[in-house]
Amino acid sequence: LPAQVAFTPYAPEPGSTCRLREYYDQTAQMCCSKCSPGQHAKVFCTKTSDTVCDSCEDSTYTQLWNWVPECLSCGSRCSSDQVETQACTREQNRICTCRPGWYCALSKQEGCRLCAPLRKCRPGFGVARPGTETSDVVCKPCAPGTFSNTTSSTDICRPHQICNVVAIPGNASMDAVCTSTSPTRSMAPGAVHLPQPVSTRSQHTQPTPEPSTAPSTSFLLPMGPSPPAEGSTGD
């Protein structure tokens, strides 16, 4: 039979690969069927019988076409500072991302391993660079003529209001106070906010390599304590 119409298991022609969704079993020396995502190989193929696949058990998954003897365990439940953006199913691992107001301090292949609260800039300091999904807020001292009177991870330094007659000059943490009933020019009341980082998950559509490479493993590295940056408060 030509390779196109052979049924698994079959011996491939010398120099030929197996076809779509098949793998070469070294022991049987045959091309055999892979198991689909959500399944694993319960019984490996032989020269006369094809792979027997079985569904993954609860809390386990396989994301790729495979011939693994056991499904992979889903990651542990998301912690209180995280939200579950993808549930554990037979075909995909659980994905945890950081909740609003937090950023990912230690990422993993998909999602986040360790979240940390976004730095808050104390009065006299404003946000120089807003936080993102994977980076903390950077604070900077308010330049002359600007101020911030809040402890916030989103507020930037705002210009002092300009008075006809100044009662109390503004400083880095306080606006100017005017004696006249209305200032010449005033910023709109209320703090200026920077947008919170939005936790989005890019679709994982990486193509499937020939599964003959060893699986990668990640290790959680201990994180030593780090002093807060100037102008920030630990929360």
Epitope: Q4, L20, K34, L64, P207, E210
Partner: antibody
Framework: QVQLVQSGAEVKKPGASVKVSCKAS????????INWVRQATGQGLEWIGW????????QYAQKFQGRVTMTRNTSISTAYMELSSLRSEDTAVYYC????????????WGQGTTVTVSS | DIQMTQSPSSLSASVGDRVTITCRAS??????LNWYQQKPGKAPKLLIY???KLHSGVPSRFSGSGSGTDFTLTISSLQPEDFATYYC?????????FGGGTKLEIK
Amino acid sequence: QVQLVQSGAEVKKPGASVKVSCKASGYTFITYDINWVRQATGQGLEWIGWIYPRDGNTQYAQKFQGRVTMTRNTSISTAYMELSSLRSEDTAVYYCARGDRDYGYFDVWGQGTTVTVSS
Amino acid sequence: DIQMTQSPSSLSASVGDRVTITCRASQDISNYLNWYQQKPGKAPKLLIYFKSKLHSGVPSRFSGSGSGTDFTLTISSLQPEDFATYYCQQGNTLPLTFGGGTKLEIK
């Protein structure tokens, strides 16, 4: 970034052979099939076959069996497609494309190599 | 070999329109249907694989549906950069085969 860069245009006489190269970069060359697909001017796409760079094994479309030879040089992450006994109907743009053998798609393509067969 | 038939072969539409292209397989191909976009003088680009999975970087206005033998590619709101030729391709059985293409032109 992941890319495939092909050799330049070729003009051949009927009966001759042509060898097109495809250099991969930005990923592990040996872990993905390299497919070859051709497209005659104003026509659709036609799959020729694939090579698995890890072991050099191939899978050819029946139509091209006996006329096509796919090889690779893993040290320079390059795949080759040689087509022999050329005829005018082989005039086309030849593309190499990285393939996925589970879903049968091509996710990264070379820029194409124009092969003209003319006497 | 599995024959893939696309319709229409050409289509005129305007920016903002919703467009549907269909692809029919000569036999059941399960969900192993992929879609590509090709612009003149360029290589095809993968848009959708396994019937409805969006390839990375592809805008969400592209979507795929269908099963068995009949499939559709939908562009929810045409953008100027979407005018191109679209090809379907089956990934179910060797040899891998493509549809004849649908040329999407500006009305």
